[in-house]
């Protein structure tokens, strides 16, 4: 007695797919696989299959139902922090070859990495023209200010909204200042935050306000404090620089904007007699901390002249190092003072029309604004590698 197995029904390829191998008929133990065209994927129901092979059974049926070749769906694109996504191909279309365009919030953010155009590729990932599958980055625009020029030298002035949007007030032990970098870092002086280096959360960081005592400000908290390894507390002010990492990104607007770091060419805007601007809530001529944010335009002082001014007692020799720059008037009267520590001495880059930080308020004579003495600032351009390393590592 013999019996022959039933041949199986001829497999009809699903739309956008093909059968392999193609045979005249399929009998017991014969098999076929389904392969989808580029941009289509094997689906059983709505579950993806890595591959599909069916085997002909003794009763003349296939052991698995035919799958579908469904167009690849990259799914809804991820939201872009400080940006948005626009659909180019069609409203909400997220399937193979669909195009989306990321863009950053105008004025205050600019796109890094790529042009923001992404295509849904056959692998199911949104991919940029450079082949990146990660999101672009909306980086805050730095150095925007309501002030357009440094102007001439004049007395300490009250700042207006948007003049110094990078200005940060640091409270925690003493009053100090800092300058916002990017949207989650603050540049300041090492001596201003030294006591909090192991207790970063003790720092009360405020921005977006002009009035020191105002209840209206943007609160930020510190995640970590990084003090330059070359700084020695109570042994001079060389390497008087620190970075504070904020535990959250701040929202950038006309009153909260980061300061730019100096470009390689920045020294050409920081020569002797070039004007820098220092701002802060430090002591004024009346001997009290300022209620309103104040600023003063002061010229860079020749380095040798400044070194000589601080060579005589009570200052130890070598107080002024190559990592410092000096600014002020020989006649005195214009200076930063206690409470301004850590704040930025900024300069206008006339090529980019952006303000950048050239110095950090560090130290000076016992009596602020003293004739023949100058304010001494940490020379930021010497620390660009250090700043970039910290920010990229953390």
């Amino acid at each position: 007695y013999t019996s022959t197995a039933q041949p199986c029904p001829y497999p009809m390829a699903p739309p956008n797919g093909h059968v392999s191998p193609v045979q005249a008929k399929y009998i017991l133990k014969d098999s076929f696989s389904i392969f989808c065209e580029t941009g289509y994927e094997l689906l059983q129901g709505h579950l993806p299959l890595k591959s599909f092979t069916a085997v002909c059974q003794k009763d003349g049926s296939w052991d698995r139902p035919m799958p579908a070749c469904s167009i690849v769906d990259c799914g809804p694109p991820d939201d872009l922090p400080s940006g948005r996504v626009e659909y180019i191909t069609g409203p909400g279309v997220t399937t193979y070859k669909a195009v989306i365009q990321y863009s950053c919030e105008e004025t205050f953010y600019t796109m890094k990495v790529n042009d923001g155009k992404y295509v849904c590729e056959a692998d199911g990932f949104w991919t940029s023209s450079k082949g990146e599958k990660s999101l672009p980055v909306c980086e805050p625009v730095c150095g925007l200010s309501a002030r357009t020029t440094g102007g001439r030298i004049y007395g300490g002035q009250k700042a207006k909204p948007g003049d110094f949007p990078w200005q940060v007030l640091i409270l925690g032990g003493t009053t100090a200042a800092g300058a916002l970098l990017y949207d989650n870092w603050v540049l300041t002086a090492a001596h201003a935050v030294y006591e909090q280096k192991h207790d970063a959360s003790a720092l009360d960081i405020r921005m977006g306000t002009l009035k020191r005592l105002s209840p209206h400000y943007t609160q930020a908290w510190s995640e970590a404090v990084f003090i330059h390894e070359g700084y020695t507390h109570d042994a001079g002010f060389d390497n008087d620089i620190a970075l504070i990492k904020l535990n959250n990104k701040v929202v950038i607007n006309s009153n909260i904007t980061p300061i730019c770091l100096p470009r390689k060419e920045a020294e050409s805007f920081m020569r002797t007699d070039d004007i820098g601007t220092a701002s802060g809530w430090g002591l004024t001529q009346r001997g009290f901390l300022a209620r309103n944010l104040m600023y003063v335009d002061i010229p860079i002082v020749d380095h040798q002249k400044c070194t000589a001014a601080y060579e005589k007692p009570p200052y130890p020799r070598g107080s002024v190092t190559a990592n410092m720059l000096c600014a002020g008037l020989e006649s005195g009267g214009k200076d930063s003072c206690r409470g301004d520590s850590g704040g930025a001495l900024v300069f206008l880059d006339s090529e980019t029309e952006r303000w950048f930080v050239g110095g950090i308020v560090s130290w000076g004579s016992m009596n602020c604004g003293e004739a023949g003495q100058y304010g001494v600032y940490t020379k930021v351009i010497n620390y660009i590698p250090w700043i970039e390393n910290i920010i990229s590592d953390f």
Partner: antibody
Framework: QVQLVQSGAEVKKPGASVKVSCKAS????????MHWIRQAPGQGLEWMGY????????DFNQKFKDRVTLTADKSTSTAYMELSSLRSEDTAVYYC??????????WGQGTTVTVSS | DIQMTQSPSSLSASVGDRVTITCRAS??????????IHWYQQKPGKAPKLLIY???NLESGVPSRFSGSGSGTDFTLTISSLQPEDFATYYC?????????FGQGTKLEIK
């Protein structure tokens, strides 16, 4: 913040046409999609079609394809929906809704169109 | 066209109740990556407001008492503890294919 302001209520006779406008303000988007959705009294929502004001590309619910015209004026950021051969069952509130991202992100206040002899 | 069927069409409940509204699509509205169902709330005389997108994602600013679930053809909107401001009409909506369609709505009333 985007705002969509629609034209005022209309009363039309059967067989006539109505043209509803929708002006977008506070909008700096280049690629967005303006949809039109209607809601008859006491009824649900019915999608009519969309236009990309940047390219003029349109797509429609086949139910309305022969009667609806969607246009846009980029210079004034205004979209228009014209419905012809009106009948009593077209009495409804007509909404424009702007889709930037995944959904109908912003809605107009609605325009009541009454079709009555 | 994809038909969206909501149930119940109306529902009476009290403040503090847990409420579930269901929506069934006439064909699958899911891909391997996402589910193209969204939920809207509409109050009388107002435009609809998005609550849940892609089946289970809570729209920014919407209270966490709202949640959505489901894939394929069956979906639910749940309000964990009804508040007075939640009495409104709720619509499910599919954006899987054109023409986009909505459920007929579920009117949630105070008991």
């Amino acid at each position: 913040q985007v705002q969509l302001v629609q034209s005022g209520a209309e009363v039309k006779k059967p067989g006539a046409s109505v043209k509803v406008s929708c002006k977008a303000s506070g909008n700096t988007f280049t690629n967005y999609w303006m949809h039109w959705i209607r809601q008859a009294p006491g009824q649900g929502l019915e999608w009519m079609g969309y236009i990309n004001p940047n390219t003029g590309y349109t797509d429609f619910n086949q139910k309305f394809k022969d009667r609806v015209t969607l246009t846009a004026d980029k210079s004034t950021s205004t979209a228009y929906m014209e419905l012809s051969s009106l009948r009593s069952e077209d009495t409804a509130v007509y909404y424009c809704t702007l889709q930037l991202g995944r959904n109908f992100d912003y809605w107009g206040q609605g325009t009541t169109v009454t079709v009555s002899s | 066209d994809i038909q969206m069927t909501q149930s119940p069409s109306s529902l009476s409940a009290s403040v503090g109740d847990r409420v579930t509204i269901t929506c069934r699509a006439s064909q699958s509205v899911s891909s391997s990556r996402s589910t193209y169902i969204h939920w809207y709330q509409q109050k009388p005389g107002k435009a609809p407001k998005l609550l849940i997108y892609y089946s289970s994602n809570l729209e920014s600013g919407v209270p966490s008492r709202f949640s959505g679930s489901g894939s394929g053809t069956d979906f639910t909107l749940t309000i964990s503890s009804l508040q007075p401001e939640d009495f409104a009409t709720y619509y499910c909506h599919q954006s899987w294919e054109i023409p986009y369609t909505f459920g007929q709505g579920t009117k949630l009333e105070i008991k």
